[in-house]
């Protein structure tokens, strides 16, 4: 069926970057400026996305691909394809309806985006707090009692199966 259709439909021969122009006997015409077609056989070209205001151009539009936007400094992308820009805050803060606010005591945020999260409760794992938390950093839990016992092994444990929560700085 597909093969038959392609023989019958001259538009299927129009490559990406062109459109099948009904006004010109279905000739493949190049996409006009500021438009693109990312697949073949298109009957129209799509208007290029314009990165304006708080958005800035990460990748220019071409005849075969849309422009890509990111956010100006002080903002970060949200949503698929960076559909929105949200204001950055400092580490140790979170964005509220009233702007950036410091994390409450007992919570932290080690990024410029997102919300303040509670410090880890070390006692849930049978550990104690070794380094206190701050607005910017989680606590550090000490080793487990088994790690400190006289018979403790010095062998490095296997890598944890769960993804670590923080990246180095």
């Amino acid at each position: 069926f597909e093969r038959t259709r392609s023989l019958q439909d001259p538009c299927s021969n129009c490559p990406a970057g062109t459109f099948c122009d009904n006004n010109r006997n279905q000739i493949c015409s190049p996409c006009p400026p500021n438009s693109f077609s990312s697949a073949g056989g298109q009957r129209t070209c799509d208007i290029c996305r314009q990165c304006k205001g708080v958005f800035r151009t990460r990748k220019e539009c071409s005849s075969t691909s849309n422009a890509e936007c990111d956010c100006t400094p002080g903002f970060h992308c949200l949503g698929a394809g960076c559909s929105m820009c949200e204001q950055d805050c400092k580490q140790g803060q979170e964005l509220t309806k009233k702007g950036c606010k410091d994390c409450c005591f007992g919570t932290f945020n080690d990024q410029k985006r997102g919300i303040c999260r509670p410090w880890t409760n070390c006692s849930l794992d049978g550990k104690s707090v070794l380094v206190n938390g701050t607005k910017e950093r989680d606590v550090v839990c000490g080793p487990s009692p088994a790690d400190l016992s006289p018979g403790a092994s010095s062998v490095t444990p296997p890598a944890p199966a769960r993804e670590p929560g923080h990246s180095p700085q």
């Epitope: 080793p143 444990p157 890598a159 670590p164 180095p168 700085q169």
Partner: nanobody, 117 residues
Framework: QVQLQESGGGLVEAGGSLRLSCAAS????????MGWYRQAPGKQRELVAV???????NYADSVKGRFTISRDNAKNTVYLQMNSLKPEDTAVYHC???????????WGQGTQVTVSS
């Protein structure tokens, strides 16, 4: 895996100094905290000092004012400068590393420090 390699241990007279080094290698992307624990024969491993990637420190009371921990983040290395050593500082000194929160701890094989009176 995280590998920790210590160096700098040895025999020293009371009142003397030593500098321990520990280099981390391997999967160190989650390592934000490095430090030293020590273990005397038949005793529990105990904290000496730890330092975070943003240079917060914590020392055992018994070494405050005598020992100084520092780190070189670019080299993934932590140092322990030990001054005014006492016989009771004699132990195997283990390098240790972990992340923030309740992350797993990684341990070096240890380096022997012996302080003679």
């Amino acid at each position: 895996q995280v590998q920790l390699q210590e160096s700098g241990g040895g025999l020293v007279e009371a009142g003397g100094s030593l500098r321990l080094s520990c280099a981390a290698s391997g999967s160190i992307f989650s390592i934000n905290v490095m430090g030293w624990y020590r273990q005397a024969p038949g005793k529990q491993r105990e904290l000496v000092a730890v330092i975070t990637s943003d240079y917060s420190t914590n020392y055992a009371d018994s070494v405050k004012g005598r020992f100084t921990i520092s780190r070189d983040n670019a080299k993934n290395t932590v140092y322990l400068q030990m001054n005014s050593l006492k016989p009771e500082d004699t132990a195997v000194y283990h390098c240790a590393a972990t992340g923030y929160g309740s992350s797993p701890w990684y341990w070096g094989q240890g380096t022997q420090v012996t302080v003679s009176s």
